[in-house]
């Protein structure tokens, strides 16, 4: 890949092994765990990153209330099955033949079942709400400065088209970033909001996926923005299917 050409590394994904074994001796970077060649000029899909991770070691209230159908990733890490495009397979199973259906960001959207469980399609997560709490500061950040800085971050660092950053809400100390991307809106070459959100989440945790870059240094008008808590809600184009038992628990 041209992005990796000079010294055969992958700027956008440190969870790769790069080798001059591509066509014509060109540099080629393969994701750990899956062995799939990745495009180092853009973000790597969350599925391949998770697989690699498992193989390596204003006064008005503006905050959004997540809908009743919003999913939070409570299951944590697992070794996912990715399709040949690097996307999550709709059905995921563990080593003990327990299976479940996931959405396009790999979050479980059904009760767990056995090998007979059917997941007919990969349901797209079209709305992601990133809920952040920042550490105490001398005063509140200016909302429009904060908005501009976060939009710039998603555009420049994660290469996400600005139209997919739907809104930035702020009510000190809570910041909410809304990402929206319908199937029909996503063109070839567009970064997926799920991938951008995952890179952002890892950056916030101090676990940057970028090769050799310093960690995320978020500043608003020179003032450091330090995040102490992150919650991410995922909304799918089709609501999840959980049993009443779980919903009432």
């Amino acid at each position: 890949h041209t992005a990796a050409q000079d010294n055969c590394t992958c700027p956008t994904n440190k969870m790769t092994v790069c080798s001059p074994d591509g066509p014509g001796g060109r540099c080629q970077c393969r994701a750990l765990g899956s062995g799939m060649a990745v495009d180092c000029s853009t973000l790597t899909s969350k599925c391949l990153l998770l697989k690699a991770r498992m193989s390596a070691p204003k006064n008005a209230r503006t905050l959004v209330r997540p809908s009743e159908h919003a999913l939070v990733d409570n299951d944590g890490l697992y070794d996912p099955d990715c399709d040949p495009e690097g996307r999550f397979k709709a059905r995921q199973c563990n080593q003990t033949s327990v299976c479940w259906c996931v959405n396009s960001v790999g979050v479980r959207r059904t009760d767990k079942g056995d090998l007979s469980l059917r997941c007919d399609e990969l349901v797209r997560t079209h709305h992601i709400l990133i809920d952040l709490r920042h550490r105490p500061t001398a005063g509140a950040f200016n909302h429009s400065d904060l908005d501009a800085e976060l939009r710039r971050l998603f555009r420049e660092r994660y290469r996400l088209h600005p139209k997919f950053v739907a809104a930035v809400h702020y009510e000190q100390p809570t910041i909410q970033i809304e990402l929206r991307q319908n199937t029909s809106q996503k063109a070839a070459g567009d970064v997926d909001i799920g991938d951008a959100a995952y890179y952002f989440e890892r950056d916030i945790k101090g676990e940057s996926l970028f090769q050799g870059r310093g960690g995320l240094d978020l500043r608003v008008r020179g003032e450091p923005l330090q995040v102490e808590r992150t919650l991410i809600y995922y909304l799918d184009e089709i609501p999840p299917k959980f049993s009443m038992k779980r919903l009432t628990a």
Epitope: H1, V17, G22, G24, G35, A37, D83
Partner: antibody, heavy 116, light 113 residues
Framework: QVQLVQSGPEVKKPGASVKVSCKAS????????LGWVKQAPGQGLEWIGN????????NYNEKFKGRVTITADTSTSTAYMELSSLRSEDTAVYFC?????????WGQGTLVTVSS | DIVMTQSPDSLAVSAGERVTMNCKSS????????????LAWYQQKPGQPPKLLIY???TRESGVPDRFSGSGSGTDFTLTISSVQAEDVAVYYC?????????FGQGTKLEIK
């Protein structure tokens, strides 16, 4: 020129282990994936796994996991494939190969015979 | 795992004839990131290691005669020998190196009538 030279034939008893070596020359050993492939008598080819010697990343085919160990010694540019708890169906020719889109380099093969 | 299925299992042709053999994969081998198909064709003669003929579905390895050509994309691939020679008698394997574990087809045996 690129060369992969494998160790000689082995005859082993069931339950024993065998370690096949593959010495690489003519290229930078640490920056290419090196894979191992099994070919049982009269049968097709089966990918066992691979290693990236520069960082010792290793991948195994689930079918062989637990019984096979792939290692590399960068000081001698040699890769190894060790197979344990041998059984008759492990009788095969084992090849090492430099992997990659245009890496058509294979060792000559090592015949491992498992017989009581 | 990706399953590679080759057809036919064997074929016998006269020298000079054109031959095609097929390889079908259970999943696409096209990498959307670089638009490369991760499929290779190998020729294996008795007592020898496989010899790489084609990589990337259609790129001929250097030193391979131009009578050998590869085509196809996604899940369906073809190896063509435009004019078979006596030295082409061998078993031909297709291989996916798109995603672990890499897998091979069962092989197509080519004989001369």
């Amino acid at each position: 020129q690129v060369q992969l030279v494998q160790s000689g034939p082995e005859v082993k008893k069931p339950g024993a282990s065998v370690k096949v070596s593959c010495k690489a020359s003519g290229y930078t050993f640490t920056i290419y994936w090196l894979g191992w492939v099994k070919q049982a008598p009269g049968q097709g080819l089966e990918w066992i796994g691979n290693i990236f010697p520069g960082s010792a990343y290793i991948n195994y085919n689930e079918k062989f996991k637990g019984r096979v160990t792939i290692t590399a010694d960068t000081s001698t540019s040699t890769a190894y494939m060790e197979l344990s708890s041998l059984r008759s169906e492990d009788t095969a020719v084992y090849f090492c190969a430099r992997e990659g889109s245009n890496s058509g380099y294979w060792g000559q093969g090592t015949l491992v015979t498992v017989s009581s | 795992d990706i399953v590679m299925t080759q057809s036919p299992d064997s074929l016998a042709v006269s020298a000079g004839e054109r031959v095609t053999m097929n390889c079908k994969s259970s999943q696409s081998l096209l990498n959307s990131g670089n638009q490369q198909n991760y499929l290779a064709w190998y020729q294996q003669k008795p007592g020898q290691p496989p010899k790489l003929l084609i990589y990337g579905a259609s790129t001929r390895e250097s030193g391979v005669p131009d009578r050998f050509s590869g085509s196809g994309s996604g899940t369906d691939f073809t190896l063509t020998i435009s004019s078979v020679q006596a030295e082409d008698v061998a078993v031909y394997y297709c291989q996916s190196d798109h995603i672990y574990p890499y897998t091979f087809g069962q092989g197509t045996k080519l004989e001369i009538k």
